[in-house]
Every structure is written in C-alpha cells, then in structure tokens.
C-alpha cells in the first residue's frame, strides 16, 4: 500500500520540515516560521504549540518537532504531552475544589500530587501496626503476633559463613 | 517566481563531452527533486535524468553510463555532466523542477527555457 500511494501522491517524498505546496504546483517548501512537520508528505505544517502562563517551555519548536512544555514551579504536568498543569500541594494534603487540604485522619499523602489514601490496614494481614501512620506516611505493618511466639524471631539471622576447605560438623 | 535558467549547450563531435547547467532560483532548491529532459526535432519531450534532495538519481536507459547528473545546493545548480555523445543525443535539453521532490514516476512542476545540444561530424 505504501509504494501504490507514494507512486500516485507526488507530496510523499516532500520531506519533515517541509510541506508540499500546492500554491506553487506541489513543489516543496520550508514550513514557515513557528510552524513544524514531523513526517514526509504533509500538505500543510503544523502551529507549533505556545507554552504560556503556567506553561512553560521544555523543548523548543523546530522545523520538524513540536514545542514540548511542562509547568512552571509550584504545578505538575497531568494529561498526555502535559497538556495541564495542576497546582502543586504539601505532602499530606490533596487538591480539592477549594485548593489544598490536609488529609483526614487515616489517610496520607506522600507526594505533592495525587489524592489521600488510606493506611493500610495491617490486621488483615494478621499484622500490627509497628509505626504509625501520620498524614504524609503511610503506617509500617510490623510482624504478626505469631511471629512473636517463643523461639520464634521476627529477623531471620544470616547463615554463619563457613570457611573454605571446611565441611560442617 | 521560480526561475530556472539553462546553459552550456552547443555544437560536439560524436564521441565528445558537454556540461549543462541550470542555474535555480525563487525556491528551496535544497528540498527540491531536479531534472533534465530533451526534446529532438519532431519529437516528444522524453526523460534524461533526475536528481532527489537527497542526491538519489534516477536515469533514462538510453544515457545510463554516458551521462551523470548532479547538484550544488549552495550555488543553487543542477548539472548534466554528458559524455560518449551521439548523433540520437541532438535536442533541446531542459531543466525541470520536480513535483514534491520525486524522482520515481516524476511529474514537472516548472520548466525552463532550453538548451540546444547539437552532435554531429
């Protein structure tokens, strides 16, 4: 398919950076100014995309790649090619309507991004709680109880290293 | 305005050399597929040679061998460097500005004026 349509499209082999001009009987032309085209053949060249505002620009337009933004300090890229910013807020807290809020007890955060999530419930993993959980961390589930029985070690030691030439007794 | 101005042709014996040229301007000559055709007296316009931008060349059976085409995008030229003439080599030759930079089944999109290549004893 691909050989049938470069042998019928006389733009296929305009290549990236340019555009095939049908003003001027389809002979290729440079994209203009702050426009770009990323594969052969095109008709037209893209605009190229403005990081503005809240926007800021990672990588510049060329000829044959589009600007690339992310966001100023303070906000986070969310949605494919960072097609967003959304506010930053502190570890423990999540962004409501009304902006930054603490998260509920029994609940934490541990990035500046993202929602408050429950600590996880060690009992149902017959666990104890061996730290607790605070608003920016999530609880550490410690051993369960019978782990803790008599002779029984929460840590299992290291094998002792033998030496070399030395069967076990 | 795309401009395309042919020279070098004349008068060769059979067995001899001649270099067109074809001065390019009002476009991205770089980005551009460039050709030469001929047209012998009483005849159709037939293909001679194509170059793409990215210097792939493309021959008429009847000059493979004889004839080579090249280009220097910083003077804007194509040439036709034509050796072992003929008698059957005798046209006008023209310079051709290629359609969306093909040379496989290339199309035309403007022509220039011509040079008159003449073989003979």
């Known amino acids: 398919f691909e050989r049938t349509r470069s042998l019928q499209d006389p733009c296929s082999n305009c290549p990236a950076g340019t555009f095939c001009d049908n003003n001027r009987n389809q002979i290729c032309s440079p994209c203009p100014p702050n426009s770009f085209s990323s594969a052969g053949g095109q008709r037209t060249c893209d605009i190229c995309r403005q990081c503005k505002g809240v926007f800021r620009t990672r990588k510049e337009c060329s000829s044959t790649s589009n600007a690339e933004c992310d966001c100023t300090p303070g906000f986070h890229c969310l949605g494919a090619g960072c097609s967003m910013c959304e506010q930053d807020c502190k570890q423990g807290q999540e962004l409501t309507k009304k902006g930054c809020k603490d998260c509920c007890f029994g609940t934490f955060n541990d990035q500046k991004r993202g929602i408050c999530r429950p600590w996880t419930n060690c009992s149902l993993d017959g666990k104890s709680v061996l730290v607790n959980g605070t608003k920016e961390r999530d609880v550490v589930c410690g051993p369960s109880p019978a782990d803790l029985s008599p002779g029984a070690s929460s840590v299992t030691p290291p094998a002792p290293a033998r030496e070399p030439g030395h069967s076990p007794q | 305005e795309v401009q395309l101005l042919e020279s070098g042709g004349g008068e060769v014996q059979p067995g001899g050399s001649l270099r067109l040229s074809c001065a390019a301007s009002?476009?991205?000559?770089?980005?551009?597929?460039m050709s030469w055709y001929r047209q012998a007296p009483g005849k159709r316009r037939e293909f001679v040679a194509a170059i793409e931008s990215g210097r792939n060349t493309v021959y008429a059976e009847s000059v493979k061998g004889r004839f080579t085409i090249s280009r220097d995008n910083a003077k804007n030229t194509v040439y036709l460097q034509m050796s072992s003439l003929r008698a059957e080599d005798t046209a006008v030759y023209y310079c051709?500005?290629?359609?969306?930079?093909?040379?496989?089944?290339?199309?035309?999109?403007?022509w220039g004026q011509g040079t008159l290549v003449t073989v003979k004893p």
């Open positions: 051709g500005l290629l359609k969306g930079n093909r040379v496989v089944s290339p199309s035309v999109a403007y």
């Open positions: 009002g476009f991205s000559f770089s980005i551009n597929a």
